[in-house]
Amino acid sequence: ATKLTEEKYELKEGQTLDVKCDYTLEKFASSQKAWQIIRDGEMPKTLACTERPSKNSHPVQVGRIILEDYHDHGLLRVRMVNLQVEDSGLYQCVIYQPPKEPHMLFDRIRLVVTKGFSGTPGSNENSTQNVYKIPPTTTKALCPLYTSPRTVTQAPPKSTADVSTPDSEINLTNVTDIIRVPVFN
């Protein structure tokens, strides 16, 4: 079985998680992409997704999550602003490719959010000031309900991240739940 690697980010409340998911330009530039959370023993939940087809450099904001798909870079940028302790968890980027199952982009992100802002005097990002300035054209895309008939795969435990490296592609088989969060205006 393929082992999944994780990259860990330990941030303080109010800070921003800012990660980029690399994908194959030729195959996936216009494909719909999503940001998911994987809770212990549960199926991945889609928190936000790009439009279908995915638009270049067009921010999509769902609550405190902002997705931007840069076709020219082959990167999906994911930002979670004003982090809260309860945002802690395991996250991943996936690409929807119906009728096939979603394609996972490595590596997963283990986010740990702790109390107390990690600022320094003069810092210009704090819990009430760090929400990204998103263009007024920001939209919320509808995420497909992506269900597989296969057996649910158990999510990895919250223990230390496995440092071994994946050697083959992984297709998700257990995406069934969609979280819908109001858009910030």
Partner: antibody
């Protein structure tokens, strides 16, 4: 164990060319972005070039744009830096570095190879 | 291009003392900042990323803080092996990825 081993450095005259190689092992090379970072003698670190993993996108510092070309051979687990029209100010130790999957920060570095450009 | 400025250029500290290194970005990089340690004749080593996350195998005496434009690397009790040059690097937005000019931590 992750390993990166640079080679190809040496002495060259201004205007000359060199090709650096970085052989890697211990991780799935094709998945990760890789960068070249250099350090002039007694100076600080300067990012030179990056090549993404899945997308293959390439980026260059302004100081080398049009003269250097980054490439990779995923079947050989090797990263390259073709350096043309070399200048005296290109003299440095050149490191190849593996990046995080999720951001351009460098979690593994090679030992470096010295490039000396002198007449 | 985002310019990273480190201070002081040199920090003289006695073993066992606390060392505080600063890094300032010319514009906000949020938490997209890393710290590296480099000893003479060696390649840099990743210490901290995401402004505050310790890299694998890095001792707890190293801690990072800050966000936006102001960042700090703290070494709580300097050990002999900690005397080295430290660099900050921003990885916000797109290349070029830029480093600070470095802070040399030397024995007082």
């Amino acid at each position: 164990e992750v390993q990166l081993l640079e080679s190809g450095g040496g002495m060259v005259q201004p205007g000359g060319s060199l090709r650096l190689s970085c052989a890697v092992s211990g991780f799935t090379f094709s998945r990760y972005a890789m960068s070249w970072v250099r350090q002039a003698p007694g100076k600080g670190l300067e990012w030179v070039s990056e090549m993404r993993g899945s997308s293959g996108s390439t980026y260059y510092a302004d100081s080398v744009k049009g003269r250097f070309t980054i490439s990779r051979d995923n079947s050989k687990n090797t990263l390259y830096l073709q350096m043309n029209s070399l200048r005296v100010e290109d003299t440095a130790i050149y490191y190849c570095a593996k990046e995080f999957s999720s951001n351009s920060l460098f979690d593994y570095w090679g030992q470096g190879t010295l490039v000396t450009v002198s007449s | 291009e985002i310019v990273m400025t480190q201070s002081p250029a040199t920090l003289s500290v006695s073993p066992g003392e606390r060392a505080t290194l600063s890094c300032r970005a010319s514009q906000s990089v949020n938490s997209n900042l890393a710290w590296y340690q480099q000893k003479p004749g060696q390649a840099p080593r990743l210490l901290i990323y995401g402004a505050s996350t310790r890299a694998t195998g890095i001792p707890a005496r190293f801690s990072g803080s800050g966000s936006g434009t102001e960042f700090t690397l703290t070494i709580s009790s300097l050990q002999s092996e900690d005397f080295a040059v430290y660099y900050c690097q921003q990885f916000y937005n797109w290349p070029p990825w830029t480093f600070g000019q470095g802070t040399k931590v030397e024995i007082k």
